[in-house]
Interface confidence: medium
């Protein structure tokens, strides 16, 4: 997987009036990294991992950049002509990637009220838009505004591409984010489900990257999908991920079941703990 930096900026308008606040979230390699939720914001590192990447006293730069980007997006929202009554949002998502072969990708996407209406490849400067007439009207409106000062636009988007990659490389230099493998901690618990049955839950946490196989096996054979319930693979705030899988089994059959985990080429199996059922809850 490539290394990536993703900026997600959102500004709001109410009855055609652009609000002063904005929300910016930054994800590094898919992990929540920075958050800025006031006009005069402090960029808030999302967990110790982000602080380790940023190092001491380097958040001013991020705060300045994110605040500037928020102002630019508010100006763009002010130029959208079909503002209707009520609450509306304009969202800009900007992503840059560095692949293993050192090639790069950069793109920018605009959403109005959650609907994608305009995208740009920041390397080729190629614009694309959906087919719907509303999206096309919005897209022309925004694109024309962004092109009003052609010189500014050219330098602006070149800078956006270059700055994003520069920031990504700077974060990678910290060494904390460099492509790494962190194996999961796997924990199996059991809880009473109904008379004669127990729910067994297998949790994997603290792993990186996010790709993981977690499933229940009976007699060494994977259970069918419809007999298992999976949790989402979610960031845990430490630059790593967590997930779970659960199934219901007959009490007394525990030794026939294993939780199978595969991650980054390594795999392991984990037994159902024996003993009394202490937790009275059910995932179903």
């Amino acid at each position: 997987e490539p290394h990536s930096l993703r900026y997600n900026l959102t500004v709001l308008s109410w009855d055609g009036s652009v609000q002063s606040g904005f929300l910016t979230e930054v994800h590094l390699d898919g992990q929540p990294f920075l958050r800025c939720d006031r006009q005069k914001c402090r960029a808030k590192p999302q967990g110790q991992w982000a602080e380790d990447v940023l190092g001491n006293k380097t958040w001013d730069r991020e705060t300045r950049d994110l605040t500037g980007n928020g102002k630019d997006l508010r100006m763009t929202l002010a130029h959208i002509k079909d503002q209707k009554e009520g609450l509306h949002s304009l969202q800009e998502i900007r992503v840059c990637e560095i692949h293993e072969d050192n090639s790069t990708r950069s793109s920018q996407h605009f959403y109005y009220d959650g609907e994608l209406f305009l995208s740009q490849n920041l390397e080729t400067k190629e614009w694309t838009m959906p087919q719907s007439s509303r999206a096309q009207t919005l897209a022309m409106n925004v694109r024309n505004f962004l092109k009003e000062d052609a010189m500014k636009t050219k330098t602006h988007y070149h800078a956006m591409h270059a700055d994003c990659l520069q920031e990504l490389r700077r974060y990678l230099k910290s060494g904390v984010v460099l492509r790494r493998t962190v194996p999961p901690m796997v924990n199996v618990t059991r809880s009473e489900a109904s008379e004669g049955n127990i729910t067994v839950t297998c949790r994997a946490s603290g792993f990186y990257p996010w790709n993981i196989t977690l499933s229940w096996r009976q007699d060494g054979v994977s259970l069918s999908h419809d007999t298992q319930q999976w949790g989402d693979v979610l960031p845990d705030g430490n630059g790593t991920y967590q997930t779970w899988v659960a199934t219901r089994i007959c009490q007394g059959e525990e030794q026939r079941f294993t939780c199978y985990m595969e991650h980054s080429g390594n795999h392991s199996t984990h037994p159902v703990p024996s003993g009394k059922v202490l937790v009275l809850q059910s995932h179903w």
Epitope: D219, G220, Q255, R256, S268, T269, P271, V272
Partner: antibody, heavy 115, light 108 residues
């Protein structure tokens, strides 16, 4: 490739104890599955004797429960059968096998109980 | 314990013939805990069909299995010389796990 290999004395005197070893290669006995002892009598009847599971749980055939013990050595990836107070009725070929649907078997070791 | 009764005890078949072996249980068995084994003369038993109807690795497609509850069967679509063996059914639903008494298949 998973392989199981039984080893044992071949001849045991009545009333003595029988000890057999199953050495597993190509798969860790702590990873998954049950690790079984099965025997086949001279008339070809098969009898499941018991297992030790990957987690260390043991289950035995009630007909042998007072005489049988299955243990393991995880560092050597081996599991063992001990059968006490043997008689001529225990003369059989003894197999170790993996799983519940026994997908891998050893080649078997023939045990004769005779004075 | 669950007793498995196989029939026939022995049978002889010509090459190309269709063969069916049945296994009847004294109590209902979960289909995921029912298996068939083949034992050729002088060899260890070999898993043939697992979980009632799934062919074990390397088993030819002429073998098939079916059944549920207390009644299960093994079918050889077209008998071949290499199929000469004793066939055993086995249940893993309840302890003790038990085997059928075997069906010895010979070639005419």
């Amino acid at each position: 490739d998973v392989q199981l290999q039984e080893s044992g004395p071949g001849l045991v005197k009545p009333s003595q104890s029988l000890s057999l070893t199953c050495t597993v290669t190509g798969y860790s006995i702590t990873s998954d599955y049950a690790w079984n002892w099965i025997r086949q009598f001279p008339g070809n009847k098969l009898e499941w004797m018991g297992f030790v599971s990957y987690s260390g749980t043991t289950k035995y055939n009630p007909s042998l429960k007072s005489r049988i013990s299955i243990t393991r050595d995880t560092s050597e990836n081996q599991f063992f059968l001990q059968l006490n107070s043997v008689t001529s009725e225990d003369t059989a070929t003894y197999y170790c096998a993996r799983g519940y649907g026994f997908d891998y078997w050893g080649q078997g070791t023939t045990l004769t109980v005779s004075s | 314990e669950i007793v498995l009764t196989q029939s026939p005890t022995t049978m002889a078949a010509s090459p190309g013939e269709k063969i069916t072996i049945t296994c009847s249980a004294t109590s209902s068995i979960s289909s995921i805990y029912f298996h068939w084994y083949q034992q050729r003369p002088g060899f260890s038993p070999k898993l043939l069909i697992y979980r009632t109807s799934n062919l074990a690795s390397g088993v030819p497609a002429r073998f098939s299995g079916s059944g549920s509850g207390t009644s299960y069967s093994l079918t050889i679509g077209t008998m071949e010389a290499e199929d000469v063996a004793t066939y055993y059914c086995q249940q893993g639903t309840t302890i003790p796990f038990t085997f059928g008494s075997g069906t010895k298949l010979e070639i005419k």
